[in-house]
Interface confidence: medium
């Protein structure tokens, strides 16, 4: 969590002199409670916006907007504390609006905005706006909170942001996985325009279980420049016994911009469909026997359906 460009953090507007300050997320009014405190924010809205840095990079930001209630407590409103909590890490970042002049009622409802919290793709945040001073212990709360889910890098607008491009969002490997027979998977994917290695992560599961029954990491060496954007194929030779027939193939690139943390793409192959009714036993004897072992190879109708999805 960070703020986009510390320059030009503005909260002043006509009729209000205001400054934005860094905050420890522990306002002084917690420690020294006041008798008279303002009411809570109204209509807190969080939206995904995109902002350029001075260097020209594009980042997703949380656009925070709220209004004031039309009651006399605005006379005691000294500012606001904006807090963003990243839920999976418990990391919190706060800023404080400090009002340098008294608020007065005017013909329009007071509205405040702030768009400088940089957020990460595929993360959830809790955004809280506290009016200051904070209430006395056991006083009515004067804050409003909302959760905000940032889309992942598959989202069209997110895909072109700097953090997504850095993690390889523009690479579409167009993975295809084909079951050649019960023991062979063929994986095809398109290489990116960078001489970097890839890993294929294979995880196999029994038909209706989520316990893996096989896992393997397979290293693909860095392609040469003439192989950029070309299709690469990998044959995974399995021992498909124990009903270990549902395979998830995940491709992990190691681009220089994201190293071990690049977006992974995956495809899944399902177990072959089981016939609803058992094959009828023929009422005649065949005149020939199949060659030893040949019956172990399944026909084309044994091919598991393969579908393509992305995973981060």
């Amino acid at each position: 969590l960070r703020l986009l460009d510390h320059r030009a953090l503005v909260c002043s507007q006509p009729g209000l002199n205001c400054t934005v300050k860094n905050s420890t997320c522990l306002d002084d009014s917690w420690i020294h409670p006041r008798n008279l405190t303002p009411s809570s924010p109204k209509d807190l809205q969080i939206q995904l916006h995109f902002a350029h840095t001075q260097q020209g990079d594009l980042f997703p930001v949380a656009h925070i907007e709220w209004t004031l209630q039309t009651d006399a407590s605005i006379l005691y409103l000294e500012g606001a504390e904006l807090s963003v909590l990243q839920l999976n890490t418990n990391e919190r970042l706060c800023v404080r609006f400090e009002f340098l002049s008294k608020l007065r009622h005017h013909h329009r409802r007071w509205r405040f905005t702030f768009s400088h919290f940089v957020v990460d793709p595929d993360q959830e945040y809790e955004v809280t706006v506290h009016h200051l001073p904070k209430p006395i212990p056991d006083g009515d709360p004067n804050h409003q909170s909302k959760n905000f889910l940032v889309p992942d890098c598959e989202h069209a607008r997110m895909k072109v942001t700097t953090p997504c491009m850095s993690s390889g969002s523009l690479w579409d490997p167009n993975i295809t996985v084909e079951t050649l027979d019960t023991q062979h998977l063929r994986v095809d994917f398109t290489l990116w325009n960078e001489s970097t290695h890839y890993q294929i992560l294979l995880t196999s599961f029994p038909h209706m279980e989520n316990h893996s029954c096989f896992e393997h990491m397979h290293h693909i060496p860095a392609p040469r420049p003439e192989e950029f954007h070309q299709r690469s194929n990998v044959t995974l030779t399995l021992r498909n016994l124990k009903g270990c027939c549902r395979h998830q193939v995940q491709i992990q690139p190691f681009f220089s911009s994201c190293l071990n943390d690049c977006l992974r793409h995956s495809a899944t192959v399902s177990c072959p469909e089981m016939p609803d009714t058992p094959e009828p036993i023929p009422d005649y004897m065949p005149l020939w026997e199949p060659r030893s072992g040949s019956s172990d190879y399944k026909d084309d109708d044994d091919k598991g359906s393969s579908h393509h999805h992305h995973h981060h």
């Epitope: 023991q183 294929i200 279980e209 316990h211 693909i220 690469s232 194929n233 021992r239």
Partner: antibody, heavy 131, light 107 residues
Framework: QVQLQESGPGLVKPSETLSLTCTVS????????WNWIRQSPGKGLEWIGD???????NYNPSLKSRVTISVDTSKNQFSLKLSSVTTADTAVYYC?????????????????????????WGQGTTVTVSS | DILMTQSPSSLSASVGDRVTITCRAS??????LGWYQQKPGKAPKRLIY???SLQSGVPSRFSGSGSGTEFTLTISSLQPEDFATYYC?????????FGPGTKVDIK
């Protein structure tokens, strides 16, 4: 290199439960199947069952109703429990690792093989079922 | 279950002899077969995997061949330390099954 060591009581009473543990040293329990095999006196080898480090199990149908195999990845151990034992369960019990990997690289085309089959065995522990 | 049979069940041979042991599967198992050597009081030791691949550290006098239902273990020149019992193991389908063994002793 990987070594396996079976441990557990050498004598079990009929109708009780036989419990054995196999400790894996010199390598990780991850990404392999781990097997139990037994050999009755003067008889051949019988596969009891196996477990993948994720907990996925496979049992010999002839013993399935009495067998439980479990794994403790934090201790690098896997265990066998065989319930309602009789004198016919007297045997040397072995634990063994299953699996061998091989990779082949070509120009733009790669192959990966996985071979099942027990390649590393414990030295075995004798269990006698007797009252 | 896949039934594995071995022949002969025992054989007597001299040092330097060429020895061949056969293993048959009751149904096709591709090349999903290993050969194991066991000496008295010891655990089995794998010699061959995938029907014909020599296990690392095993002398080259041991070789395996076959696919489908018929497999062969050959010892090209029997050495004193090779007197033991030999088992085949199929790992094509559950349950894994071993052959009954072939005991090789000194003539």
């Amino acid at each position: 290199q990987v070594q396996l060591q079976e441990s557990g009581p050498g004598l079990v009473k009929p109708s009780e439960t036989l419990s054995l543990t196999c400790t894996v040293s010199g390598g990780s329990i991850s990404n392999y199947y781990w097997n139990w095999i037994r050999q009755s006196p003067g008889k051949g080898l019988e596969w009891i069952g196996d477990i993948y480090y994720s907990g996925s199990t496979n049992y010999n149908p002839s013993l399935k109703s009495r067998v439980t195999i479990s794994v403790d990845t934090s201790k690098n151990q896997f265990s066998l429990k065989l319930s309602s034992v009789t004198t016919a369960d007297t045997a040397v019990y072995y634990c063994a690792r299953d699996g061998e990997l091989a990779n082949y690289y070509g120009s733009g085309s790669y192959q990966f093989y996985y071979y099942y089959g027990m390649d590393v065995w414990g030295q075995g522990t004798t269990v006698t079922v007797s009252s | 279950d896949i039934l594995m049979t071995q022949s002969p069940s025992s054989l007597s041979a001299s040092v330097g002899d060429r020895v061949t042991i056969t293993c048959r599967a009751s149904q096709g198992i591709r090349n999903d077969l290993g050969w194991y050597q066991q000496k008295p009081g010891k655990a089995p030791k794998r010699l061959i995997y995938a029907a014909s691949s020599l296990q690392s550290g095993v002398p080259s006098r041991f070789s395996g061949s076959g696919s489908g239902t018929e497999f062969t273990l050959t010892i090209s020149s029997l050495q004193p330390e090779d007197f033991a019992t030999y088992y085949c193991l199929q790992h094509n389908s559950n349950p894994f099954t071993f052959g009954p063994g072939t005991k090789v002793d000194i003539k």
